[in-house]
Amino acid sequence: SGTTNTVAAYNLTWKSTNFKTILEWEPKPINQVYTVQISTKSGDWKSKCFYTADTECDLTDEIVKDVKQTYLARVFSYPAGHVESTGSTEEPPYENSPEFTPYLETNLGQPTIQSFEQVGTKVNVTVQDEWTLVRRNDTFLSLRDVFGKDLIYTLYYWKSSSSGKKTAKTNTNEFLIDVDKGENYCFSVQAVIPSRRTANRKSTDSPVECMGHEKGESRE
């Protein structure tokens, strides 16, 4: 039999951050290889990662075609050294992944504070707009391009001499906050998609940036 001693994959898991999307599964192969197929609910199956001994497959190129679609993947198990033969009619064992909707489920990557500039008692803090592999008209889109106003940033800011964190929010990538003159402040940002109701609605915090370091600029 063409599928003797092959084990079906299990624990199929989507790992996705800022739309970079990898399907992972188990077990580590012993005398077998895998091929992955992906499709939308209404589309045809497309094969990827042919006869791989890996237990992961990068499906980013497929899901970025329409990040609002819902995708399903499946992993086929074949004997090691398997060569596709036209005469084979036996379907190899396979396992389906959970459904995955990138727009709703991709994790938000850790944001970065690009710069901050103080003018008197105002500070303008700018969050770096991350590029994704999502394209429109042959142009790569930023996270802001993809999510639009669905994506907000929360800024935590505090006096270097104090522990209490004030907050500000924006649906752009810029904050303009009031600060006390002569005080140094530290900043950290968090990306949030408030419309999500699941565990992936917030990113991890950006690295903390403080005034008096190279990212900032001060003008009277």
Epitope: I152, T154, Y156, S163, G164, K165, K166, T167, A168, K169, T170, N171, D178, S188, Q190, V192, P194, S195, R197, T198, A199, R201, K202, T204, D205
Partner: antibody, heavy 120, light 107 residues
Framework: EVQLVESGGGLVQPGGSLRLSCAAS????????IHWVRQAPGKGLEWVGY????????YYADSVKGRFTISADTSKNTAYLQMNSLRAEDTAVYYC?????????????WGQGTLVTVSS | DIQMTQSPSSLSASVGDRVTITCRAS??????VAWYQQKPGKAPKLLIY???FLYSGVPSRFSGSRSGTDFTLTISSLQPEDFATYYC?????????FGQGTKVEIK
């Protein structure tokens, strides 16, 4: 169903301590901000402080700074308000409320409140 | 801190009346203002967010508006269940602050 349930209120002497709990269900506190708000008898609403359980960040009203501490245990899906050096003016119903951290970010769900009475 | 000055502190009205409550912010808060309704012995309930957006499940007789730093809550036709205390709140900056409250009583 989203629910917040406060507990731990009671009668305490001036200078004493009390710890209030805010148990959340129907959502994970790690993904939201939790605020504490109080209301003295016959008075208006006064914001006490907040915690972002995902990073532990907090901020307090000047009236409680240095005396009150907000914490969270994400494994228990519960936020806490530790109140020390209590004064008569801290007598109030204490509410916890959820902040969805949206741009408009109002407090969309509130607990039923727990009464704290500071009296000798 | 931003002050929210709410007026009137109380008002008497009849069922069917149009009721208007105002809040003035001491500085710009954009549209980051919410309105809450509170009944005796109960927690506040969100009515309006972002100055003018009706929260889900809230009857359409409630509406909110903004003019600069002035914010208004309007009840177009007061119902028996609307007799309560109403609070505005700004959440533009930390700390978030509440108005003093307006008690709507039966005339």
């Amino acid at each position: 169903e989203v629910q917040l349930v406060e507990s731990g209120g009671g009668l305490v002497q001036p200078g004493g301590s009390l710890r209030l709990s805010c148990a959340a269900s129907g959502f994970t506190i790690n993904n939201y901000i939790i605020h504490w708000v109080r209301q003295a008898p016959g008075k208006g609403l006064e914001w006490v402080g907040y915690i972002d359980p995902s990073n532990g960040y907090t901020y307090y009203a000047d009236s409680v700074k240095g005396r009150f501490t907000i914490s969270a245990d994400t494994s228990k899906n519960t936020a806490y308000l530790q109140m020390n050096s209590l004064r008569a003016e801290d007598t109030a119903v204490y509410y916890c409320a959820r902040d969805p951290q949206s741009l408009s970010s109002p407090f969309d769900y509130w607990g039923q409140g727990t009464l704290v009475t500071v009296s000798s | 801190d931003i002050q929210m000055t709410q007026s009137p502190s109380s008002l008497s009205a009849s069922v069917g009346d149009r009721v208007t409550i105002t809040c003035r912010a001491s500085q710009d808060v954009n549209t980051a203002v919410a309105w809450y309704q509170q009944k005796p012995g109960k927690a506040p309930k969100l009515l309006i967010y972002s100055a003018s957006f009706l929260y889900s499940g809230v009857p359409s007789r409630f509406s909110g508006s903004r003019s600069g730093t002035d914010f208004t809550l309007t009840i177009s036709s007061l119902q028996p269940e609307d007799f309560a205390t109403y609070y505005c709140q700004q959440h533009y900056t930390t700390p978030p602050t509440f108005g003093q409250g307006t008690k709507v009583e039966i005339k």
